[in-house]
Amino acid sequence: KESCDVQLYIKRQSEHSILAGDPFELECPVKYCANRPHVTWCKLNGTTCVKLEDRQTSWKEEKNISFFILHFEPVLPNDNGSYRCSANFQSNLIESHSTTLYVTDVKSASERPSKDEMASRPWLLYR
């Protein structure tokens, strides 16, 4: 019988460059077998990861994978930083690799990374 764990598919050193003022969806790809797990997002602050309990989140279900989405509407400069998603599964907590958002303030939008730069560092397995 195959093992059936909840799985989180964020690669190590995942990163995304975004503009302040734009809407953005941060996706946590989740695989599960039967019951959808309770998934949360947190933001790294020093040695702790602070739960983002008051933020808008949603699920997007696709054929082979689901996405737990953290919504930024809009992105603010202080959204810059590293995030993890985590899931509770059979009393176990599993935490993803961190994914880092690099927020460019609209005032310095000329510093936005080029499409080539962004293409060279895909931040998720599923996008």
Partner: antibody
Framework: QVQLKESGPGLVAPSQSLSITCTVS????????VNWVRQPPGKGLEWLGM???????DYNSALKSRLSINKDNSKSQVFLKMNSLQTDDTARYYC????????????WGQGTSVTVSS | SIVMTQSPDSLAVSLGERATINCKAS??????VAWYQQKPGQSPKLLIY???NRYTGVPDRFTGSGYGTDFTLTISSLQAEDVAVYFC????????FGGGTKLEIK
């Protein structure tokens, strides 16, 4: 239960290539990443690379030019190929499964011993 | 790549006593550190992940701690079956292992 088993040639001549197969059971390669790690006799562990669920790969930058990792999901097999072997590639080669979050290796094969010698 | 410097290289501790193994990362790796135990003639086994979480079935005498660059594996009361080589590993970027610590009974 979860199992991984490596099979390799045992002996490889210098400058030749190495091919090792990791056959897994108890889980699907469409659900977990698989790593390759080696250990020279009496020494430490060296991560070689890994293959993700979607078939994309990450490699140890020092060995990238010599390594290739592929898989066949339907056969539950992962393949390591390494070119231009030298005597210091003599080691035990392990495949190991990623944890569900990708942040450690939770199941390891027993390894296959590879000796590079003429 | 991130270098994991493990100390000491070898350690002899009396049965029932505490054993402490250290690992220092060349740059911050958050809590992306795992510890493995390798007994003679066996493959490595996962002991600790997320720097401080005990893996399923691992006795509670094994404790991991640390964050950033400095990490510690502690065995609170050494048992005969704990004789092994212990490795730390970072998974923050491309995985790298410490050089290993050989733990023996004094």
């Amino acid at each position: 239960q979860v199992q991984l088993k490596e099979s390799g040639p045992g002996l490889v001549a210098p400058s030749q290539s190495l091919s090792i197969t990791c056959t897994v059971s108890g889980f699907s390669l469409t659900g977990y990443g698989v790593n390759w790690v080696r250990q020279p006799p009496g020494k430490g562990l060296e991560w070689l690379g890994m293959i993700w669920i979607d078939g994309s790969t990450d490699y140890n930058s020092a060995l990238k030019s010599r390594l290739s990792i592929n898989k066949d999901n339907s056969k539950s097999q992962v393949f390591l190929k390494m070119n231009s072997l030298q005597t210091d590639d003599t080691a035990r080669y392990y495949c190991a499964r990623d944890r569900p979050d990708g942040r450690a290796m939770d199941y390891w094969g027993q390894g296959t011993s590879v000796t590079v010698s003429s | 790549s991130i270098v994991m410097t493990q100390s000491p290289d070898s350690l002899a501790v009396s049965l029932g006593e505490r054993a402490t193994i250290n690992c220092k990362a060349s740059q911050s790796v958050s809590n992306d550190v795992a510890w493995y135990q390798q007994k003679p003639g066996q493959s490595p086994k996962l002991l600790i992940y997320y720097a401080s979480n005990r893996y399923t079935g691992v006795p509670d005498r094994f404790t991991g701690s640390g964050y950033g660059t400095d990490f510690t594996l502690t065995i609170s009361s050494l048992q005969a079956e704990d004789v092994a080589v212990y490795f730390c590993q970072q998974d923050y970027s491309s995985p790298t292992f410490g050089g290993g610590t050989k733990l023996e009974i004094k």
